[in-house]
């Protein structure tokens, strides 16, 4: 069985204030069973950006349909970027557990930084 890899191809993403940013994340295996969440930052201070299973994340949309059984693309779009959005974003695979899911593997991260202002 192939070991799961979390692929975030862009190390750096330059974004424009007010625009939409696309953060890419694909996985190489459907196993283990469990959700993929997005965070900004690492460690206990990390900020939850998107959780497909619970919560309401109005500025975030998924690129693919996460409800499809064989989906391996967990990329997201964040709309209406502000300066407070800068930071490094990680897609993180969790293994289904009881009562709590357990963090399994993190992508390498994509740093979001502000590029040129809109003309």
């Amino acid at each position: 069985e192939e070991e799961l890899q979390m692929i975030q191809p862009e190390k750096l993403l330059l974004v424009t204030v007010g625009k939409t940013a696309t953060l890419h994340c694909t996985v190489t295996s459907l196993l283990p069973v469990g959700p993929v969440l997005w965070f900004r930052g690492v460690g206990p201070g990390r900020e939850l950006i998107y959780n497909q299973k619970e919560g309401h994340f109005p500025r975030v949309t998924t690129v693919s349909d996460l409800t499809k059984r064989n989906n391996m693309d967990f990329s997201i779009r964040i709309s209406s970027i502000t300066p407070a959005d800068v930071g490094t974003y990680y897609c993180v695979k969790f293994r289904k557990g009881s009562p709590e899911n357990v963090e399994f593997k993190s992508g390498p991260g994509t740093e979001m930084a502000l590029g040129a202002k809109p003309s």
Partner: antibody, heavy 119, light 108 residues
Framework: DVQLVESGGGVVRPGESLRLSCAAS????????MNWVRQAPGEGLEWVSR????????DYADSVKGRFTISRDNSKNTLYLQMNSLRAEDTAVYYC????????????WGLGALVTVSS | ETVLTQSPATLSVSPGERATLSCRAS??????LAWHQQKPGQAPRLLIY???NRATGIPDRFSGSGSGTDFTLTISSPQTEDSAVYYC??????????FGGGTKVEIK
């Protein structure tokens, strides 16, 4: 329906401590950043502190830094504000407020808890 | 730090007479501005977010406009129950979150 109910307010002397609680219901508490905002008698709204969804990331207004500690227990759907070394100028109604998403406005407010610091 | 200045401090209007409240930011906040209403003895309530979007359950007599540094909250035909203090809040740069000083609206 979203509900936020503060408790723990009261009258204390300068230098004493108090802990406020905010019981949350009607939403996925662990998915949202939470805040404390206060309002001195006859005055406007002053943001006090913020805690991220996981509880490991905190921010404070300069006026309370080093004296107040925000925390949360996601298993109990409860937000806390530990207030030490209280001063007369901390006298206010303290509101807990839910954030719409991690980088956003406050969409729901509690009813408030009155803290009076007086000798 | 971004400072929000609201004007006027007090606004007295007759029922049905248009009320216009202003909020000015010391630097651009894009469209990241919300308006909250606070009636006497009550907690604040969200009215408008992202400068112009009405929150759930807010009557359409309330509208918001503006971007950058200048924002307006309009009550097209005020009712007596609209007597309250109105606060703007920016969430473009934080921490700290900032509120304006408030505008007290009195319905004659």
């Amino acid at each position: 329906d979203v509900q936020l109910v503060e408790s723990g307010g009261g009258v204390v002397r300068p230098g004493e401590s108090l802990r406020l609680s905010c019981a949350a219901s009607g939403f996925s508490f662990r998915s949202y950043a939470m805040n404390w905002v206060r309002q001195a008698p006859g005055e406007g709204l002053e943001w006090v502190s913020r805690i991220n969804s996981g509880g490991g990331g905190t921010d404070y207004a300069d006026s309370v830094k080093g004296r107040f500690t925000i925390s949360r227990d996601n298993s109990k759907n409860t937000l806390y504000l530990q207030m030490n070394s209280l001063r007369a100028e901390d006298t206010a109604v303290y509101y807990c407020a839910k954030q719409y998403d991690w980088n956003s406005f406050f969409d729901y407010w509690g009813l408030g808890a009155l803290v009076t610091v007086s000798s | 730090e971004t400072v929000l200045t609201q004007s006027p401090a007090t606004l007295s209007v007759s029922p049905g007479e248009r009320a216009t409240l202003s909020c000015r930011a010391s630097q651009t906040v894009g469209s990241k501005l919300a308006w909250h209403q606070q009636k006497p003895g009550q907690a604040p309530r969200l009215l408008i977010y992202d400068a112009s979007n009405r929150a759930t359950g807010i009557p359409d007599r309330f509208s918001g406009s503006g971007s950058g540094t200048d924002f307006t909250l309009t009550i097209s035909s005020p009712q007596t129950e609209d007597s309250a203090v109105y606060y703007c809040q920016q969430y473009y740069y934080w921490p700290p979150y900032r509120f304006g000083g408030g505008t007290k609206v009195e319905i004659k």
